[in-house]
């Protein structure tokens, strides 16, 4: 495979990763798939420094990240360990609130207007952030 050594047009480089910030909104699953089509993933926040970087770029707008608990436990989309990793939830979050009247609880995490995290209904059309790592060999699968 080939290694990506610089970020694509319209992406922002930071600490050996590339970030792309949407200016439109989609449901979490559609945002997740959008990132996958870019050979990326929804942003995975692993440090306070990365949190501040993303927060600076998105501003005070609800924005999806690559964290969900749709299958039970909270999981990062790239396999980063949730339990031992960085967290920045709002107080009393996540709460899997059922009172929104939309059916079910809240299974997808997003940045809130102050940057701290909240769980919300995955169908809400929020902005999103894609991330891909530099120097990661892109796996071009063999032809069948």
């Amino acid at each position: 495979g080939s290694e990506r050594t610089c970020c694509p047009v319209n992406w922002v480089e930071h600490e050996r990763s590339c970030y792309w910030f949407s200016r439109s909104g989609k449901a979490w699953a559609d945002a997740d798939n959008y990132c996958r089509l870019e050979d990326a993933h929804l942003v995975v926040v692993t440090s306070w420094e990365e949190q501040k970087f993303v927060q600076h770029h998105i501003g005070p707008v609800n924005t999806w990240m690559g964290l969900h608990d749709q299958n039970g436990p909270w999981k990062w989309v790239d396999g980063t360990d949730y339990e031992t990793g960085f967290k920045n939830w709002r107080p009393e979050q996540p709460d899997d609130w059922y009172g929104h009247g939309l059916g079910g609880g809240e299974d997808c995490a997003h940045f809130t207007d102050d940057g701290r995290w909240n769980d919300d209904v995955c169908q809400r059309p929020y902005r999103w952030v894609c991330e891909t790592e530099l120097d990661k060999a892109s796996q071009e699968p063999p032809l069948l």
């Epitope: 495979g1 080939s2 694509p8 319209n10 949407s22 200016r23 439109s24 909104g25 989609k26 559609d30 945002a31 798939n33 959008y34 996958r36 089509l37 870019e38 050979d39 059309p125 902005r127 999103w128 892109s138 796996q139 071009e140 699968p141």
Partner: antibody, heavy 122, light 108 residues
Framework: EVQLLESGGGLVQPGGSLRLSCAAS????????MSWVRQAPGKGLEWVSV????????FYADSVKGRFTISRENSKNTLYLQMSSLRAEDTAVYYC???????????????WGQGTLVTVSS | DIQMTQSPSSLSASIGDRVTITCRAS??????LNWYQQKPGKAPKFLIY???SLHSGVPPRFSGSGSGTDFTLTISSLQPEDFAIYYC??????????FGQGTKVEIK
């Protein structure tokens, strides 16, 4: 100039297989997700499958899932669609299309090939 | 899947006429709406994205509007080369993209 040229269509019996190819030129092929869209005779357009630029992520319409496989060879600027267990309802012109996108998050099919006809009949 | 419904399915118009085609989505798709033109025996041609943004090289007589579930494609002054089938397509559901059934614009 962006160009997409499909090939590999033809007449095949139900249950048979066929592999379509799409040769791309005029742009950095590996930077774009590529898709197949089909059109049955006298009918509208139906999205079939899409593949990310590296080939690492693939998606399929429910109507072809498990029967069709999309792939690409970036060194040859070529997209493929391997079709198996073909049915009469797969008869269509198959178009290769580039997934364009702009900075806000909107995407679209900005360039299309001329299409290749697949006829499934006994 | 999101269903896209166009109306009318066909229309007859004269050169110079103002033509409007509508497209309705089965659920809110914000502005994730594209328009394509297809002539007989040819591949579709990309016209408009994000409901109202013209693709490069598309004549300004074409315009799009709408958001949510209701959208329109307008040709301000129909030209001979505009007789074709027009399709809308939603790009909200990535990548479960769906098209309208098409609207045929014929010569009166």
């Amino acid at each position: 100039e962006v160009q997409l040229l499909e090939s590999g269509g033809g007449l095949v019996q139900p249950g048979g297989s066929l592999r379509l190819s799409c040769a791309a030129s005029g742009f950095t092929f590996s930077s774009y997700a590529m898709s197949w869209v089909r059109q049955a005779p006298g009918k509208g357009l139906e999205w079939v499958s899409v593949l990310s630029g590296s080939g690492g992520s693939t998606f399929y319409a429910d109507s072809v899932k498990g029967r069709f496989t999309i792939s690409r060879e970036n060194s040859k600027n070529t997209l493929y669609l391997q079709m198996s267990s073909l049915r009469a309802e797969d008869t269509a012109v198959y178009y290769c299309a580039r997934r364009g996108r702009e900075y806000s998050g909107y995407d679209y099919f900005d360039y299309w090939g001329q299409g290749t006809l697949v006829t499934v009949s006994s | 899947d999101i269903q896209m419904t166009q109306s009318p399915s066909s229309l007859s118009a004269s050169i110079g006429d103002r033509v409007t085609i509508t497209c309705r989505a089965s659920q809110n798709i914000s502005s994730y709406l594209n328009w394509y033109q297809q002539k007989p025996g040819k591949a579709p041609k990309f016209l408009i994205y994000a409901a109202s943004s013209l693709h490069s090289g598309v004549p300004p007589r074409f315009s799009g509007s709408g958001s949510g579930t209701d959208f329109t494609l307008t040709i301000s002054s129909l030209q001979p080369e505009d007789f074709a089938i027009y399709y809308c397509q939603q790009s909200y559901r990535t990548p479960l993209w769906t098209f309208g059934q098409g609207t045929k614009v014929e010569i009166k």
